[in-house]
């Protein structure tokens, strides 16, 4: 038997999969666990294999189905169940009536690029993957930039309040490395959270042209 | 197998109200949304609502104008759809359905004749 | 609401025929369509679901195609049980809808 508090939380990407975390206080003793996913409305259901993350935690993705397809509507429940294995047997060790609109994240935004950099600007791209169409604009986005000497916790958050795939960044110090990262929300859900960073994009300021004021 | 049974015809007056049932057997009733489409004649369907046995939620068409309730008794498998207010546009065949990706299994169908 | 419109209204094929129907939503419902095939005086039949999932039962000369706003139903070759009515349905968001109904007769 497992005693303790326990914590099972899960996001959708808004797509074709959904990720969960199950904390449990107390020592499981090299048991398999799982998580179940049935929905209320669907034909498919899935499973995914817990497999640890911390002493007292552990992770799994629900793949509903192919990266792009989307799998789940505003009108679904899903009923997630963490299944632990005792004997021959599988004990249900918690769960939730989970709203998949109520509850995103989205992916990280990938293909981060730079459209064009001067001495103390520069604009740069991104794209969001695995986004519903459901959303159609109403995403919004966090940028944040790394300076030479500073940590990311210490850079400020720039907030783009709009589908803006884009920003140009000022103030720049001329012939510097700087890098740049991005995340996403959507405007919809209760419980809806920021996306994951993305990959940092670095770049560097063209220097300043000799003889002139910077 | 799955079978939805429903109640037979009925004939209301205007402003009269109608309850039609919907016993289910065959699969667990909990677990499946079941939802109310309704059928004038010579006409296409139209999806009046829906309700999940397990918890009892509902969700309706607002074009019924609140006339509508569902509800269900967990202990007999039987949905009930009562229509309130009868016009002479509610005639149809009213029939149940189980939902599970698509109406894949439906009741015979109840005709409700609205007549003064 | 989403409308699903339904073309043809009617159609008359011979049995061998291939035949297609298509529908058309207002709003991308990606592929949460189904279709359905009803005869006089009975409940309507789930025919194919989430847009191509052959529903359990039907013959496999029924198929389903599209995403988004515009779907297919095809009839590989008409037998003679499958002139009837031929509808099709979103079950992407409330209040679920249906198209007007094609109807499919006996050349």
């Known amino acids: 038997a497992v005693n303790g508090t326990s914590q099972f939380t899960c996001f959708y990407n808004s797509r074709a999969n959904i990720s969960c975390v199950w904390s449990q206080d107390g020592a499981l003793q090299d048991t398999s666990c799982q998580v179940h996913a049935w929905p209320d409305r669907r034909r498919w259901n899935q499973t995914c294999e817990l497999l640890p993350v911390s002493q007292a935690s552990w992770a799994c993705n629900l793949i509903l189905g192919a990266p792009d397809s989307q799998k789940l509507t505003t009108v679904d429940i899903v009923t997630l169940r963490v299944l632990c294995r005792e004997g021959v047997r599988w004990r249900v060790m918690a769960i939730q009536d989970f709203k998949p609109f109520e509850n995103l994240r989205l992916m990280a935004p990938i293909s981060l690029q730079v459209v064009h950099v001067e001495t103390h600007r520069c604009n740069i791209s991104w794209e969001i993957s695995q986004a519903s169409h459901y959303f159609e604009r109403h995403l919004e986005f966090e940028a944040r930039t790394l300076s030479p000497g500073h940590t990311w916790e210490e850079a400020p958050l720039l907030t783009l309040k709009q589908k803006q795939e884009w920003i140009c960044l000022e103030t720049l110090t001329p012939d510097t490395q700087y890098e740049f990262q991005v995340r996403v929300k959507p405007l919809q859900g209760e419980f809806t959270t920021w996306s994951p960073w993305s990959q940092p994009l670095a770049f560097r300021t063209k220097p300043a042209a000799l003889g002139k004021d910077t | 197998q799955v079978q939805l049974v429903q109640s037979g015809a009925e004939v209301k007056k205007p402003g009269a109200s109608v309850k039609v049932s919907c016993k289910a057997s065959g699969y667990t009733f909990t677990s499946h949304w079941i939802s109310w489409v309704r059928q004038a004649p010579g006409q296409g369907l139209e999806w009046m609502g829906d309700?999940?046995?397990?918890?009892?939620?509902?969700n309706y068409n607002e074009k019924l104008q609140g006339r509508v309730t569902m509800t269900v008794d967990t202990s007999t498998s039987t949905a009930y759809m009562e229509l309130r207010s009868l016009r002479s546009d509610d005639t149809a065949v009213y029939y149940c359905a189980r939902e599970r990706g698509g109406f894949d299994y439906w009741g015979q169908g109840t005709l409700v004749t609205v007549s003064s | 609401d989403i409308q699903m419109t339904q073309s043809p209204s009617s159609l008359s094929a011979s049995v061998g025929d291939r035949v297609t129907i298509t529908c058309r939503a207002s709003?991308?419902?990606?592929?949460?369509l189904n279709w359905y095939q009803q005869k006089p005086g009975k409940a309507p039949k789930l025919l194919i679901y989430?847009?191509?999932g052959l529903h359990s039962g039907v013959p496999s000369r029924f198929s389903g195609s599209g995403s988004g706003t515009d779907f297919t139903l095809t009839i590989s070759s008409l037998q003679p049980e499958d002139f009837a009515t031929y509808y099709c349905?979103?079950?992407?968001?409330?209040?679920?809808?249906f198209g007007q109904g094609t109807k499919l007769e006996i050349k």
């Open positions: 309700i999940y046995p397990g918890s009892g939620n509902t």
């Open positions: 349905q979103q079950d992407n968001n409330h209040p679920y809808t």
């Open positions: 989430y847009t191509s």
């Open positions: 709003q991308d419902i990606s592929n949460f």
